[in-house]
């Protein structure tokens, strides 16, 4: 989404980003759309510090993040590079289990009850987290 100078009401500011934590559950695509309508995106986890922050706020409930492999390779919704980026998968995950007959495998990533990541079928009604970046320019000293 576009950058902001301050976080919207009911969003939590952390390290120059704003986060909104859902209480209800939605399928991944519906959650993704919800965040986009808020001029944001599903959360993109880029560091262990950010992982701990999100984990603290979501508690022990499966929660969608902005990571999927619905078109082949794993991709973050904001374009952050998956291969070189932070990862926190559970052991043996992602397993991309193909037995569900949905076409493709388990294509969407979520935080599990212990915070580590798992891939699951995208229609599951999990909570989700939206993220949007604060206006970085407003954080810098003005040019003289």
């Amino acid at each position: 989404g576009s950058e902001r100078a301050c976080c919207p009401v009911n969003w939590v500011e952390h390290e120059r980003s704003c986060y909104w934590f859902s209480r209800s559950g939605k399928a991944w695509a519906d959650a993704d759309n919800y965040c986009r309508l808020e001029d944001a995106h599903l959360v993109v986890v880029t560091s262990w510090e950010e992982q701990k922050f999100v984990q603290h706020h979501i508690g022990p409930v499966n929660t969608w993040m902005g990571l999927h492999d619905q078109n082949g390779p794993w991709k973050w919704v904001d374009g952050t590079d998956y291969e070189t980026g932070f990862k926190n998968w559970r052991p043996e995950q992602p397993d991309d289990w193909y037995g569900h007959g949905l076409g493709g495998g388990e294509d969407c990533a979520h935080f599990t009850d212990d915070g580590r990541w798992n891939d699951d079928v995208c229609q599951r009604p999990y909570r989700w987290v939206c993220e949007t970046e604060l206006d970085k320019a407003s954080q810098e000293p003005p040019l003289l």
Epitope: A27, G101, V121
Partner: antibody, heavy 120, light 107 residues
Framework: QVQLVESGGGVVQPGRSLRLSCAAS????????MHWVRQAPGKGLEWVAV????????NYADSVKGRFTISRDNSKNTLYLQMNSLRAEDTAVYYC?????????????WGQGTTVTVSS | DIQMTQSPSSLSASVGDRVTITCRTS??????LAWFQQKPGKAPKSLLY???SLQSGVPSKFSGSGSGTDFTLTISSLQPEDFATYYC?????????FGGGTKVEIK
């Protein structure tokens, strides 16, 4: 042991209201999602509603949406189903059932059921 | 909504028989399938979840298998206490939906 006991059923006229209760014991109620499932006489099982462990998420079957409300009081270990604008087709045995997790993990423990009859 | 179709709707079998009940879903449901047993006048009892995982206290003569849209419940050696109606249920997404039931009767 884990136990669910429903109450509040009875005979009611069409258009009237009824509130069912489900008293839980033997487990940490506030950690589990809860469901209502019903069974019309001689018919199969029909899921009615779910409420997540903390009350944050509620979902309903289309057949009851806008008429029934699921709620819970974790301090009293009790689940409720408020049924308004009752119809003859709501006649059934109503079961409360525990979710295996917070609300999206399927059912494991069931109550014995309470009978609701909607008739004029 | 996801439709659940059970077959057969009823079957007659003898003690000791191996019985198989099939559940077909209108779309893939991942591993989010459960089986329940219900005896007349009683509440349903959970047998299996996640297709093949036995609920605590359920004997191993009950087993589940399948993937995609086709699932089966097998009772390896039918005993008198197993004569009942069996239901499959998907819990991949809301609304949760049940199959129409399979009544297992004594031959």
């Amino acid at each position: 042991q884990v136990q669910l006991v429903e109450s509040g059923g009875g005979v009611v006229q069409p258009g009237r209201s009824l509130r069912l209760s489900c008293a839980a014991s033997g487990f940490t109620f506030s950690s589990y999602g809860m469901h209502w499932v019903r069974q019309a006489p001689g018919k199969g099982l029909e899921w009615v509603a779910v409420i997540w462990y903390d009350g944050s998420n509620k979902n309903y079957a289309d057949s009851v949406k806008g008429r029934f409300t699921i709620s819970r009081d974790n301090s009293k270990n009790t689940l409720y189903l408020q049924m308004n604008s009752l119809r003859a087709e709501d006649t059934a045995v109503y079961y409360c059932a525990r979710d295996q997790g917070v609300g999206y993990d399927g059912l494991d423990v069931w109550g014995q059921g309470t009978t609701v009859t909607v008739s004029s | 909504d996801i439709q659940m179709t059970q077959s057969p709707s009823s079957l007659s079998a003898s003690v000791g028989d191996r019985v198989t009940i099939t559940c077909r879903t209108s779309q893939g449901i991942g591993k989010y399938l459960a089986w329940f047993q219900q005896k007349p006048g009683k509440a349903p009892k959970s047998l299996l979840y996640k297709v093949s995982s036995l609920q605590s206290g359920v004997p191993s003569k009950f087993s589940g298998s399948g993937s995609g849209t086709d699932f089966t419940l097998t009772i390896s050696s039918l005993q008198p206490e197993d004569f009942a109606t069996y239901y499959c249920q998907q819990y991949m997404t809301y609304p949760l939906t049940f199959g129409g039931g399979t009544k297992v009767e004594i031959k």
